[in-house]
């Protein structure tokens, strides 16, 4: 019986037998017109599966069924009979082993093994014809017909819909004749279906519906191509803007041709001077998988300007799954001198096409939404950078993203574009041969954008040292070297082995720059992370400091300070993480503006009060400065005569 | 820049929300059975059964005739009256369980849940392109039906499938009924039987061949007959039933039962398990 794998669907819901058309017959390895039993199966009486589709359809050729049954009879009744082979049907008759009759010990001479009911010992296995594509649909009615050489399953569903689908096993999608709702009640379609002439009768609730075997109509086909590709028996034709049967639109109905259909194009704008490679999307362009366009059949105009058809780049041809459809057409747009700036239409006209399998392409499709624009360059920065290149140039202007090609040239060499938008282009400069000022220009669509700009190549920056070798988010780092201002910005980056974070240094001196560490989160507040800290200027060689310790930032206390006891001469306060960064940043503790020689004991800071310090009535402010950032933590006070501490 | 057209899904070329209005008929109750007839003189009909009523529709789905099939015991029941003066059994609604055409006559046969599941035979009378039903014949002969042996008790209230086959000059009804202990005890319908319609339509010939679920299994082993059909030399029934008499009765599978359409006997009754799978 064949396949044993897969998910079983043991419960038959509905069935119908019918002779099959040529195509399905071939797939089932039987002759056309042979009778096949079709069954809709579910996983259980409730019909709801765990995984997989709700309903599956299996096909059992009757001749094969009969053969299997006959072979089963032979196994039971012809010697040698396999020992232990049961006659079965124990619910109808007394249990017995083959070849014995039911309930009898052995055959008597005048009884025949074949003259008693039998359950054939092997089953007939089949897999879902629809390959799971019925998905959530719960089929409740089935009737199969042969139309031309096509076999169609007419199915009613639990939610009151009719699905008319070609029965074919080789596809990965369903070929629908129709899929429509019988009415608004949404009641299940009942099991029994009857045929009357060219119609099927389905019952749902208290209603009987008469459904044409060739489908209820053609209006559900939205495109001309899909309409004229419909099965011949459906009688679909194109009526200018809809698919219909001849009786619905006798005047305009035709099955001969389809106009091309533009659905989209790219880009939506192009330069008034210079060319644009225009890609048109849609259907019914040329009906040839290779994309070959016969000479002189396709004419594209954008506004007043012609667009010259381009041969399809075979390297770009994508395998299109038959379930998706789109056609691409490319042409080169060179605006005429008379073309005006502003919005216009894209028009595709196809004529003199040889007929395709289903129809020929003929007609015009117009789509609005293309604009001719004039790019303007307003500003460029920076206008200098290291000879090594890699400087990130920002070009600002208007309509900079129009068309399909643009190039920034620095001394004739392309500046690699990193980002393109309507008002801004970003690119990385190429290396320069010498320290010099060179011309910079922008081309859009091969035509130069007006404006005269120069770029200055400078000596490459050299980083000699980075200090200190530890820090935390936003703490200062000093970079020493030469020509450090040749780059628009030095970039500081920390790499922990997995990821990198960066910050930019503000331009200062050619030999020294002060930078801040980038944003980096140290997960463990008690620990730190070691990694590489690097500094580089644009494309010039950088400098890397290995074993850089990235620490959690220190947290100043939020509480006011406890007042000093009469005998105390030092102030103690907690400052989490401050001791850990003492080697990395400058720390200064002052009381009343006077510095104290502080010590760290874990997260405690001990600050001996300077002998010269006079604590007045209001006490003295305690200030801690870390890496140049100062916080007043509170005031140091002695208790008053009444014993109440005086502090703020 | 390598811009490519976005893929249009195949489904975008169709709209399955488009409303289609197809001809329909409102039966006035849940449709229980339906069968169509096409004559060779361009006449046709649709027969639609609901509780206690049988509608005859023309090819345009307009009502041509309506016949009261119940409730049994009601003076308005037109089919009941064909069996002569009653009572014929307990009163109650008639749910149509069988609605088939006897191709040999041609005639419509309807069997209901009332009156021991007896059947009625309605001659088809063409009137233009439509068809009318003649007064029904009651396929029941009281004198040869007993609770333990009832050739004229055809329909089971739990469901019955019938396929009519012409053999020689006789019409044979291949009948498959779902049973339980209660149904089996009342006028003994059989699981599978082959019944010959008597030439005079007074019922079915006694001594018909049959198979029935054994009494000891009736409680736990129920067979649902899903479909029946005749093709070539055989009549086939499709069933959903427990996979085993001894194991869990909720573990179901599907079987095909095959009976000879040329010999009205059950010695060559065969069953085959049908296995349908989804292989992702």
């Amino acid at each position: 019986g064949a396949p044993e794998g897969g998910q079983p669907y043991p419960v038959l819901r509905v069935a119908h037998s019918a002779p099959v058309g040529a195509q399905l017959a071939t797939e089932l390895s039987i002759a056309e017109g042979q009778e096949v039993l079709f069954g809709v199966f579910v996983t259980g009486k409730d019909g709801g599966p765990g995984v997989g589709p709700n309903s599956v359809v299996c096909a059992f050729p009757i001749d094969l069924l009969d053969t299997l049954i006959d072979e089963g009879v032979e196994r039971c009744c012809e010697s040698p009979v396999h020992p232990g082979l049961r006659r079965g049907l124990d619910f109808f008759q007394s249990p017995s082993f083959c070849p014995n009759p039911p309930g009898l010990e052995a055959l008597s001479p005048n009884t025949s093994c074949r003259h008693f009911p039998l359950l054939v010992s092997s089953s007939f296995s089949r897999v879902d014809l629809f390959n799971g594509l019925l998905g959530p649909v719960q089929v409740t009615a089935l009737y199969v017909t042969r139309l031309d050489n096509v076999t169609v399953a007419h199915m009613g569903t639990m939610d009151g819909r009719i699905l008319q689908v070609e029965l074919v096993r080789s596809l990965n999608y369903l070929l629908y004749v129709s899929n429509f709702s019988l009415g608004d009640s949404g009641q299940p379609v009942q099991r029994d279906v009857s045929r009357l002439g060219d119609h099927l009768l389905f019952a749902s609730g208290d209603q009987v519906f008469q459904v044409p075997i060739q489908g209820p109509g053609c209006r559900h086909f939205l495109t001309c191509g899909r309409c004229l590709r419909a099965w011949h028996f459906m009688g679909c034709g194109w009526c200018g803007n809809m698919c219909g049967q001849q009786k619905e639109c006798p005047g305009s109905w035709q099955q001969d041709h389809c106009p091309p259909k533009l659905t989209e194009f790219h880009p939506h704008s192009g330069p008034l001077r210079g060319s644009t490679r225009l890609t048109l999307c849609g259907s019914n362009f040329y009906l040839h998988p290779s994309g070959l366009v016969p000479e002189g059949t396709h004419q594209v105009t954008v506004g007043q300007s012609p667009c010259r058809p381009l041969p399809k780049d075979s390297s770009k041809l994508r395998p299109v799954p038959r379930k998706d459809f789109v056609e691409e057409f490319e042409c080169e747009l060179e605006p005429l001198g008379t073309q005006a700036v502003g919005p216009t239409n894209v028009s595709l006209t196809v004529t003199n096409m040889p007929p395709g399998k289903h129809f020929r392409v003929d007609g015009t499709s117009v789509l609005r939404g293309f604009s001719f624009m004039e790019p303007v360059l307003i500003a460029v920065q920076p206008l200098f950078g290291p000879r090594a290149g890699g400087t990130c140039l920002t070009l600002e202007g208007q309509s900079l993203s129009v068309g399909t090609s643009r190039a920034v040239l620095v001394n004739g060499t392309e500046c690699l574009l990193a980002r393109v938008s309507e008002g801004q282009l970003l690119c990385a400069t190429p290396p320069g041969a010498t320290v010099a000022s060179v011309p910079l220009s922008l081309q859009v669509g091969g035509a130069q954008v007006p404006g005269s700009w120069t770029f200055q190549y400078r000596e490459d920056p050299v980083v000699l040292s980075i200090s200190p070798n530890c820090g935390y988010i936003n703490s200062h780092i000093t970079i020493c070297g030469q020509h450090l201002t040749s780059a628009w910005h030095l970039v500081l980056s920390f790499h922990d082995g997995l990821r990198a974070v960066e910050s930019r240094c503000e331009r200062q001196l050619p030999e020294q720059q002060l930078c801040r560490l980038p944003e980096y989160v140290v997960r463990d507040p008690q620990g730190w992370v070691a990694g590489n800290l690097s500094a580089r200027g644009d494309g010039a060689a950088g400098f890397t400091l290995p074993g850089f310790r990235f620490l959690p930032p220190p947290h100043p206390p939020s509480a006011n300070l406890v007042p000093l006891k009469p005998e105390e001469h030092a102030i103690k306060f907690e400052y989490i993480g401050l001791g850990a960064v003492a080697d990395c940043v400058g720390i200064n503790v002052t009381v009343g503006g006077e510095s104290c020689q502080h010590e760290f004991r874990g997260d405690m800071v001990v600050c001996p009060l300077p002998p010269s310090l006079q604590l007045g009535q209001d006490g003295a402010p305690l200030q801690v400065c870390v890496d140049g950032e100062c916080h007043i933590l509170g005031r140091v006070v002695r208790p008053g005569p009444d014993g109440v501490p005086q502090s703020t | 820049e390598d811009w490519q057209c976005p893929r249009t899904p195949y489904a975008a070329s169709r709209d399955f929300d488009v409303k289609y209005v197809v001809p329909s008929f409102s039966a006035g109750g849940l449709v229980q059975a339906m069968v169509t007839y096409e004559g060779d003189r361009n006449e046709s009909a649709v027969f639609v059964a609901i509780r206690n009523r049988l509608h005859v529709l023309g090819p345009d789905l307009k009502s041509v005739q309506s016949l009261a099939t119940g409730p049994a015991g009601d003076p308005g029941c037109q089919t009941c009256a064909a069996c002569g003066p009653g009572p014929h059994g307990p009163p109650g609604d008639t749910d149509t369980k069988v609605l088939v055409l006897d191709p040999a006559l041609p005639a419509l046969v309807s069997c209901g849940s009332s009156l021991q599941g007896r059947c009625f035979l309605h001659d088809l009378e063409p009137q233009g392109t439509a068809v009318h039903l003649a007064a029904p014949a009651c396929l029941f002969s009281a004198h040869h039906n007993r609770p333990d042996d009832c050739p004229d008790c055809v329909a089971s209230p739990l469901g019955t499938r019938v396929t009519v086959v012409e053999q020689g000059q006789a019409s044979y009804f291949y009948v498959a009924s779902s049973l339980d202990a209660a149904v089996a005890a009342s006028f003994s319908p059989r699981s599978v039987s082959i019944r010959r319609l008597k030439a005079d339509a007074s019922g079915f010939a006694p001594g018909f061949v049959a198979l029935s679920v054994l009494p000891k299994h009736l409680v736990s082993y129920s067979i649902e007959y899903v479909h029946s059909f005749h093709t070539g030399a055989f009549v086939y029934f499709l069933t959903v039933q427990p996979a085993s008499v001894t194991d869990d009765p909720s573990a179901l599978h599907t079987r095909l039962a095959r009976l000879s359409a040329t010999e009205p006997e059950l010695g060559d009754y065969r069953e085959l398990v049908l296995d349908c799978r989804f292989a992702p």
Partner: antibody, heavy 121, light 107 residues
């Protein structure tokens, strides 16, 4: 009152055909089956076939297929039987008979007077 | 085809006597048997249907019985007008068939 009036006697030559009629009155012609029965001189009754005027459905005894053709005319409430390729074996009295309460092949409650057909050269 | 055998071929009785006609079927036919009377040069006339059901207008002296394969028509007091041929007919199976008939003679 139910009556079946058959056409008069026929003397015909071998190899020819004859059509005999049976006009019904006193009941609804289309609601009852009409049977035809043959009786050879001095012999028993032999069923030929029936026609149901309601739908012009017919059934024949295998022995008479090709020999007898049954038709009915609703407008005149008349049933007809045509006998073809006549031989001396076809010489007999032919009766039309209406079926009673049960249909198809039950008891025949009303009979025509019979039409004698003689086949002779 | 079902064969109906009527015995005897001829019955000779005196008026007022009780007479029985026998009809035997080649297979069981339930009660689907009907009896006809045919007088000389006349048409058959239905006497009994379904083995035992009487027909309106038929004298009550005619009765029938039997089921399965053996059937009997009785005239409980023969009258001279009963001189005729008597035929049984089965309507169980196609083709419907008639017995060969029994001739009733009056002594």
């Amino acid at each position: 009152e139910v009556q079946l009036q058959e056409s008069g006697p026929e003397l015909v030559k071998p190899g020819t055909s004859v059509r005999i009629s049976c006009k019904a009155s006193g009941y609804t012609f289309t609601s009852y089956y009409m049977h035809w029965v043959k009786q050879r001189p001095g012999q028993g009754l032999e069923w030929i076939g029936y026609i149901y005027p309601g739908n012009v459905n017919t059934k024949y005894n295998e022995k008479f297929k090709g020999k007898a053709t049954l038709t009915a005319d609703k407008s005149s409430s008349t049933a007809y039987m045509q006998l073809s390729s006549l031989t001396s074996e076809d010489s007999a009295v032919y009766f039309c008979a209406r079926l009673g309460y049960y249909r198809y092949g039950g008891a025949m409650d009303y009979w025509g007077q019979g039409t004698a057909v003689t086949v002779s050269s | 085809d079902i064969v109906l055998t009527q015995t005897p071929a001829i019955l000779s009785v005196s008026p007022g006597e009780r007479v029985s006609f026998s009809c035997r079927a080649s297979q069981s036919i339930g009660t689907s048997i009907h009896w006809y009377q045919q007088r000389t040069n006349g048409s058959p006339r239905l006497l009994i249907k379904y083995a035992s059901e009487s027909i309106s207008g038929i004298p009550s002296r005619f009765s029938g019985s039997g089921s399965g394969t053996d059937f009997t028509l009785r005239i409980n007091s023969v009258e001279s007008e009963d001189l005729a041929d008597y035929y049984c007919q089965q309507s169980d199976s196609w083709p419907t068939t008639f017995g060969g008939g029994t001739k009733l003679e009056i002594k």
